[in-house]
């Protein structure tokens, strides 16, 4: 091989050993009988050499560096050539390096022809082995802008004070052009500007300078995104670290088309904008770091460009034509507002009228679609009223409290489905019978299902909450005196899978005077926890509640109260509890405002627990928690 470098070309060629391999035999550069492992050729030199092995590409790499000085004379702008031509070089992995030095006031722009560049992170490699490593300069410090492959969106990179561009070509790659040109620009007054062009749908992952190490202190870096107007862009931060700031705050700023508050300032920990139409800029601003403990600022983010979300092209039919007295509202979940700008998240009726809230009413079919970067930002609340006006017609009539499948198929999470159950006053009462026995939610035995039923009085003047109930317990039915609301509340997206476990039937039954009666059929396996309604606020004044507790013939039930005293202090009347054996009618009466609560008691037959409140003084409410446990009978007492 012969390499001759013209004088004044400012080119240096270096041939050196590449990555260590486990090859059995080393290879050398042979130059006038000397065996060496590194050869440097400078401008004006001509050197003839050979290799001592057949496959030098397995051992050596070649670096061709051209220094371009824009300080002392005019800059050679325009398309950059590969010099010396790749055909004149040995077939080794080649790295062409262009080191451009310029004044601080001069902006330099690298322009990449098609294909554009795609940034890669640490540990990643390019499929074709062709990589572009770009770095800039702040005074004497080298700053890595990034490493890039072909076939991406990065079209231009603007810097000032100098740029170092390294193009790595594998030994077998036929490429013989640099693929970029250099242009001069006015000062950009920041570390760099990276332009990313989207022709259509796609995504780009980009990183702050020096990633994964720290972004230079108090610097500014901007990404300009060119996005067709008919597409939408969303930004998400994949990874970031904040440094310890002494002055100023690390932040990102967006110039978003159509925003009246440009620039929009975000913290790195904020949810970033989505659903942006057209071009926008994103800038990362560092701070003055604490000298003792600077920490590092770094950011890796993704820009996703797509047609207005896939969901917006999907039409969902919500058929409420057979429903009566029902309304469905799709609305944003409540979130803490930590900033001014919130990316659009809309629900559209007939794909035309879009708003952040939409209420659909019964009696017709509705076609809806979504225009939203993240549908988990929305939820659904449904209300349905089942009322009886004529007690003769309603008595013994049953209704199934089931979420319609149309609603379950929507891509938005159901939050609450509330049934308002209304009965004629003093004429009828209600009974709720679940498909699966229910467990009452208590601190001692919390519900861990994806949904619960919240049962509360629906009489405006009455503050009575019976409790939260979920499938998988011992409560067979709940009877209530008058109007109630039953709310199915979901707690996890897995409700979709567990929807089959829902199922509650409401029946209108003859009127009774007690506020509520719980029928409990405990399982032998577990302890049943029960608590009085309105837990934490106390059973309302003069309210009476009962539990009908079944005990199988071969079992004995242990009734345990979790306090020594009820704690209630009566202003008027008496608070009492009656425990009555159903078979013998034998009963024990306890004065809750005076007596201690009973010690654990054993019941061989089904029994009632009835609790009736007085009018308590404020702050001395009636709250009771008790449990029932079944164990096999050891002696037959019948």
């Amino acid at each position: 091989f012969e390499i001759a470098l013209p004088r004044e070309s400012n080119i240096t060629v270096l041939i050196k050993l590449g990555t260590p391999t486990l090859l059995a035999k080393p290879c050398y550069i042979v130059i006038s009988k000397r065996h060496i492992t590194m050869l440097s050729i400078k401008s004006g030199e001509r050197i003839v050499f050979t290799f001592s092995c057949q496959s030098p590409e397995n051992h050596f790499v070649i670096e061709i560096q051209k220094n371009i000085d824009c300080m002392s004379g005019p800059c050679p702008f325009g398309e950059v050539q590969l010099q010396p031509s790749t055909s004149l070089l040995p077939t080794l992995n080649r790295t062409f390096i262009w080191d451009v030095k310029a004044h601080k006031s001069i902006g330099l722009e690298l322009q990449f022809s098609i294909p554009r560049l795609r940034q890669i992170g640490p540990g990643e490699s390019c499929p074709d082995g062709v990589t572009h490593s770009i770095s800039g300069r702040i005074d004497a410090t080298v700053v890595r802008i990034g490493t890039f492959c072909s076939n991406g969106t990065v079209s231009r990179i603007k810097m000032q004070e100098g740029v170092k561009m390294a193009l790595h070509l594998p030994w077998f790659h036929p490429r013989n052009v640099s693929g970029f040109s250099i242009a001069n620009r006015s000062s950009i007054k920041r570390l760099c500007i990276i332009e990313s062009v989207f022709e259509g749908e796609g995504s780009a992952t980009l990183m702050s300078a020096n990633y994964p190490e720290g972004f230079p202190e108090d610097e500014l870096m901007t990404w300009q995104f060119v996005v067709p107007a008919h597409l939408r862009a969303s930004v998400s931060f994949l990874n970031f670290n904040l440094s310890n700031c002494e002055r100023k705050e690390e932040r990102v700023e967006y110039y978003i088309p159509g925003s009246t508050t440009n620039p929009e300032v975000f913290k790195l920990e904020d949810k970033q904008p989505g659903n942006m139409a057209g071009n926008f800029n994103l800038s990362l601003q560092g701070c003055d770091q604490d000298a003792q403990s600077p920490g590092i600022l770094r950011l890796q983010f993704q820009v996703l460009v797509q047609h207005p979300q896939n969901e917006s092209n999907k039409i969902y039919v919500v058929d409420l034509s057979n429903e009566r007295a029902m309304s469905l509202t799709i609305e944003p979940r409540p979130v803490k507002q930590s900033r001014k700008f919130v990316p659009g998240c809309f629900v559209c009726l007939e794909s035309r009228t879009c708003s952040s809230n939409l209420t659909l009413t019964s009696g017709s079919k509705h076609k809806i679609s979504f225009l939203c970067d993240d549908l988990t930002r929305l939820w659904m609340n449904v209300e349905k009223t089942i009322s009886c006006t004529d007690h003769r017609y309603c008595q013994r009539k049953s209704y199934s409290l089931q979420v319609p499948s149309d609603i379950l198929h929507l891509p938005v999470e159901l939050h609450d489905f509330s049934w308002k159950l209304l009965v004629p006053k003093d004429r009828l009462s209600l009974v709720l019978v679940p498909a699966q026995k229910l467990q009452q939610h208590t601190h001692e035995k919390p519900c861990n299902t994806s949904f619960s039923y919240l049962v509360a009085s629906a009489i405006p003047s009455q503050d009575l909450y019976f409790g939260s109930f979920c499938p998988g317990g011992s409560i067979k039915q709940i009877q209530v005196k008058q109007n109630i609301s039953v709310t199915l509340r979901t707690f996890a997206p897995s409700f979709q899978q567990e929807a089959s476990r829902q199922g509650l039937t409401v029946s209108f039954i003859p009127y009774f005077k007690e506020e509520g009666v719980f029928t409990v059929t405990p399982d032998t396996k577990s302890k049943v926890y029960l608590r009085t309604p309105n837990w934490d606020r106390g059973l309302p004044s003069l309210t009476s509640v009962s539990w009908n507790i079944s005990v199988p013939r071969d079992q004995v039930a242990c009734l345990t109260f979790f306090k020594e005293r009820s704690g209630v202090v009566c202003q008027t009347g008496r608070a009492f509890m009656i425990i009555q054996e159903q078979r013998t009618r034998a009963e024990e009466i306890f004065s809750l405002d005076e007596d201690v609560l009973p010690k654990p008691s054993f019941h061989h037959h089904s029994f009632w627990v009835n609790i009736s409140n007085c009018s308590p003084t404020s702050g001395k409410q009636l709250d009771l928690l008790f449990s029932v446990t079944l164990t096999p009978r050891t002696v037959d007492l019948t």
Epitope: L14, K16, L17, P20, K25, P26, K33, R34, H35, I36, T37, M38, S40
Partner: antibody, heavy 116, light 108 residues
Framework: EVQLVESGGGLVQPGGSLRLSCAAS????????MHWVRQAPGKGLEWVAS????????YYADSVKGRFTISADTSKNTAYLQMNSLRAEDTAVYYC?????????WGQGTLVTVSS | DIQMTQSPSSLSASVGDRVTITCRAS??????VAWYQQKPGKAPKLLIY???SLYSGVPSRFSGSRSGTDFTLTISSLQPEDFATYYC??????????FGQGTKVEIK
């Protein structure tokens, strides 16, 4: 597995001689540069001599030129350092090293003490 | 002869610190500089060759760079096992081969 084992060190009087051996295994020394590097007690590293057995080329530090001779026996896969006219300042741990990606493998070292 | 002037001769640092050691060649040695780590009573170990190439098996927190005749070894986040003495060496087949004086990295 590449290994280098030095031997032949010891106590010798000024003006005396010693021959150090460096037995190599796991590679063929004829294809590599072999070096001797020494380190006086509490001091830094000092290159002593090199040989490229394939061509027989040898190189020496000025401080040992004419007194030390580096050689290699490719059949035994061993490099040698013959040290004559030893001086007190030659007291050091002598390491032999193989060079390709710089000095990529080193022996454990052998101590040479020159003292009367 | 090519002199390799290494600085500092010693430094104190804590685990997690970024440590930089520099070597200046008295004349051009291209990229033919290697860096070694040596612990007391042990032989040196190769860390970096050709100024910036990481030798196999060496943790990536070690890196080397070159600017003209100035060479730098950087340990990005010092670990307990990194407390040792570090040497630079020019190896551009320009004899004699020369080492820097060494930099002792001690625990602060």
């Amino acid at each position: 597995e590449v290994q280098l084992v030095e031997s032949g060190g010891g106590l010798v009087q000024p003006g005396g001689s010693l021959r150090l051996s460096c037995a190599a295994s796991g590679f063929n020394i004829s294809s590599y540069y072999m070096h001797w590097v020494r380190q006086a007690p509490g001091k830094g590293l000092e290159w002593v001599a090199s040989i490229y057995p394939y061509s027989g080329y040898t190189y020496y530090a000025d401080s040992v030129k004419g007194r030390f001779t580096i050689s290699a026996d490719t059949s035994k896969n061993t490099a040698y350092l013959q040290m004559n006219s030893l001086r007190a300042e030659d007291t050091a741990v002598y390491y032999c090293a193989r060079a390709y990606y710089a000095m990529d493998y080193w022996g454990q070292g052998t101590l040479v003490t020159v003292s009367s | 002869d090519i002199q390799m002037t290494q600085s500092p001769s010693s430094l104190s640092a804590s685990v997690g610190d970024r440590v930089t050691i520099t070597c200046r060649a008295s004349q051009s040695v291209s990229s033919a500089v290697a860096w070694y780590q040596q612990k007391p009573g042990k032989a040196p170990k190769l860390l970096i060759y050709s100024a910036s190439s990481l030798y196999s098996g060496v943790p990536s927190r070690f890196s080397g760079s070159r600017s003209g005749t100035d060479f730098t070894l950087t340990i990005s986040s010092l670990q307990p096992e990194d407390f040792a003495t570090y040497y630079c060496q020019q190896s551009y087949y320009v004899y004699p081969i020369t080492f820097g004086q060494g930099t002792k990295v001690e625990i602060k």
